[in-house]
């Protein structure tokens, strides 16, 4: 094949090599950019900056090499449009630093920075950590800071991410109240801070106030939906990012719902209870307190992380006629109490009957496995006489 006269020449099916001296000063308008998976750039002294717009359209890029060039600055968001990037070689350039944000969100298997005049500062604490933890092939490079010695020896005692303290109200918060949250940010070289409120939706009207180092957030006219929702304060400096999440407990009275008994591996009287603080529960059977045993007990389903409502069952193992009756669930918390009742009929008396009576219909047993808490049952092929009720 004839030698390629262009600044950048195809390499393999989805690669591009740009090695003609001084031919590039930016990466705009590279040919066939959309499908590129590999880009190799060398000897480009005029290529000094790598910015967000330079790599737009290179969504398939996996390997990027820029070596022996004049690269002095890589923007923190330079690789926003190349999320699949796994190998990044920026060796033998003029880089003094590289922000932690540049590689955040990438899954880099390899990061090569040797041969750059790195300046040891807290901004490279993340890279020092990569070296300590054996990430990205960094330890093998034995990176040096220009005139300062090995990166590994850089003092880092003062290199910390911001410290955050979020103040929430001590007093009880009721539905309709306004709540003021304050986020105090401490640390060196603070750059940005803010609130993440994605979970709040319709839980309150939100008003932000203030700025570094003290951010205010007013949640106005709060609803009970605010419970279990994260309100997150974040802050960044040249070392990294910190986040602290808090939840505001909005008090509201207990409520309860009961549903018709259903037969599963066992019988279940389904219920839902809500309230903040979480209500205490008590069952009544025909008006008297029901003592829970291994045959009749409250079983909760796994709670959803972001809501206060709890679902569950009053579980009955092999109930008989003595369990027929009126079940009441009482729920109470300091803000109110509620109750709901339901009639349940599991079976007629299976232990006594007149032989001339119609044969009672029995509930067919359900096969279960031992993880459900019932023995694995073997079904009988032979039908039993009507007097068979126990076992």
């Amino acid at each position: 094949a004839a030698p390629c006269p262009d600044a950048c020449c195809p390499h393999g099916s989805s690669g591009l090599r740009c090695t003609r001296d001084g031919a590039l000063d930016s990466l705009h308008h590279l040919p066939g950019a959309e499908n590129l998976t590999e880009l190799y750039i060398e000897n480009q002294q005029h290529l000094q900056h790598l910015e967000l717009r330079d790599l737009r359209g290179l969504g398939e890029l996996r390997n990027l090499t820029i070596v022996k060039s004049g690269l002095r600055f890589v923007a923190p968001d330079a690789f926003h449009f190349t999320p699949r990037l796994s190998r990044l070689n920026l060796s033998f350039n003029a880089l003094e630093s590289l922000s932690w944000k540049t590689v955040q969100g990438l899954s880099l298997q390899e990061l090569v920075l040797s041969g750059n005049p790195l300046h040891c500062s807290c901004a490279l604490r993340w890279l020092q950590r990569w070296e300590e933890e054996g990430l990205g092939g960094v330890p093998e490079q034995k990176l040096q800071c220009h005139g300062q010695g090995p990166l590994a020896h850089m003092p880092n005692a003062s290199c910390g991410v911001p410290t955050l303290k979020v103040q929430v109200p001590n007093a009880s918060v009721d539905v309709g109240d306004d709540v003021l949250l304050r986020c105090q940010v401490e640390g060196r070289g603070l750059e940005q801070a803010g609130w993440i409120l994605t979970e709040l939706e319709q839980s309150a009207t939100v008003m932000k106030s203030g700025g570094l180092p003290s951010l205010g957030l007013t949640l106005a006219n709060v609803t009970s939906d605010l419970n279990r929702k994260n309100v997150t304060c974040w802050a960044e400096n040249d070392v990294g990012r910190a986040e602290v999440s808090v939840q505001v407990n909005v008090s509201f009275p207990a409520s309860v719902q009961l549903h018709t008994a259903v037969e599963m591996h066992h019988w279940c009287i389904p219920f839902s209870v809500d309230g903040q603080p979480a209500p205490s529960l008590r069952w009544l059977f025909n008006g008297s307190v029901l003592n829970e045993t291994s045959f009749i007990f409250t079983e909760f389903l796994e709670p959803a992380a972001n809501e206060t409502v709890r679902h569950g069952c009053l579980r009955l193992n092999q109930p008989t006629h003595v369990n027929n009756g009126n079940y009441t669930l009482l729920a109470a918390n300091p803000f109110g109490q509620a109750s709901a009742s339901i009639m349940a009929a599991f079976m007629d008396n299976p232990f006594e009957f007149n032989p001339e009576d119609p044969i009672p219909v029995s509930f067919s047993p359900v096969d279960t496995n031992s993880t459900s808490g019932d023995p694995v049952e073997k079904k009988d092929e032979t039908p039993f006489g009507v007097s068979v009720a126990v076992g």
Epitope: T298, Q318, G373
Partner: antibody, heavy 115, light 108 residues
């Protein structure tokens, strides 16, 4: 498959406290099951001691209630029996089992009350 | 009364049918469970609930109930069925469990 294993001292002095632990494997003690203790004096029948649920509910044999404590340790997936003020009449093989059907049992451990 | 009463001993000829009974007031209200225990071993559940058999229990074992009496029937007894058999159920109060005194089954 669920397995249960009792452990604890085989000899307890009169008026002392009998302490046994039942380790549950092959399943979580926090599942929808209760856990129970049963004992059997040498040459005699079975006697139910009590039961516990992982949320803390407990029921005891009325004849032993004043002396029995059953507790659960979810982090270790085990439950325990304490029987205080023991006498020679408390000498027995002690079994742990899964309630309510007692479909899984430990192999049992003999506890002798003697000075 | 919080008691379940069983016959202390019952015998059966090999291959014949035998019925072991358990009596008590609580059996008018609750199902009985039945356990087989061989010397030096832990009991094994053979029947529970409304005549249910755990897997691995032969179908010659069945349970029934009438009035205050629960019965365990072994149809075609085998030599390996020789063991002690215990019934249990909830006490009448429903708040605790009780065992019968046990029946020693001999297969002749």
């Amino acid at each position: 498959e669920v397995q249960l294993q009792e452990s604890g001292p085989g000899l307890v002095k009169p008026s002392g406290t009998l302490s046994l632990t039942c380790a549950v494997s092959g399943g979580s003690i926090s599942s929808s099951n209760w856990w129970t203790w049963v004992r059997q004096p040498p040459g005699k029948g079975l006697e139910w001691i009590g039961e516990i649920y992982h949320r803390g509910n407990r029921n005891y044999n009325p004849s032993l209630k004043s002396r029995v404590t059953i507790s659960v340790d979810k982090s270790k997936n085990q439950f325990s029996l304490k029987l205080s003020s023991v006498t020679a009449a408390d000498t027995a093989v002690y079994y742990c089992a899964r309630a309510p059907w007692f479909d899984y049992w430990g192999q049992g451990t003999l506890v002798t009350v003697s000075s | 009364s919080s008691e379940l009463t069983q016959d202390p001993a019952v015998s059966v000829a090999l291959g014949q049918t035998v019925r072991i009974t358990c009596q008590g007031a609580s059996l008018r209200s609750y199902y009985a469970s039945w356990y087989q225990q061989k010397p030096g071993q832990a009991p094994v559940l053979v029947i529970y609930g409304k005549n249910k058999r755990p897997s691995g229990i032969p179908d010659r074992f069945s349970g029934s109930s009438s009035g205050n009496t629960a019965s365990l029937t072994i149809t075609g007894a085998q030599a390996e069925d020789e063991a002690d058999y215990y019934c249990n159920s909830q006490a009448s109060s429903g708040n605790h469990l009780i065992f019968g005194g046990g029946t020693k089954l001999t297969v002749l």
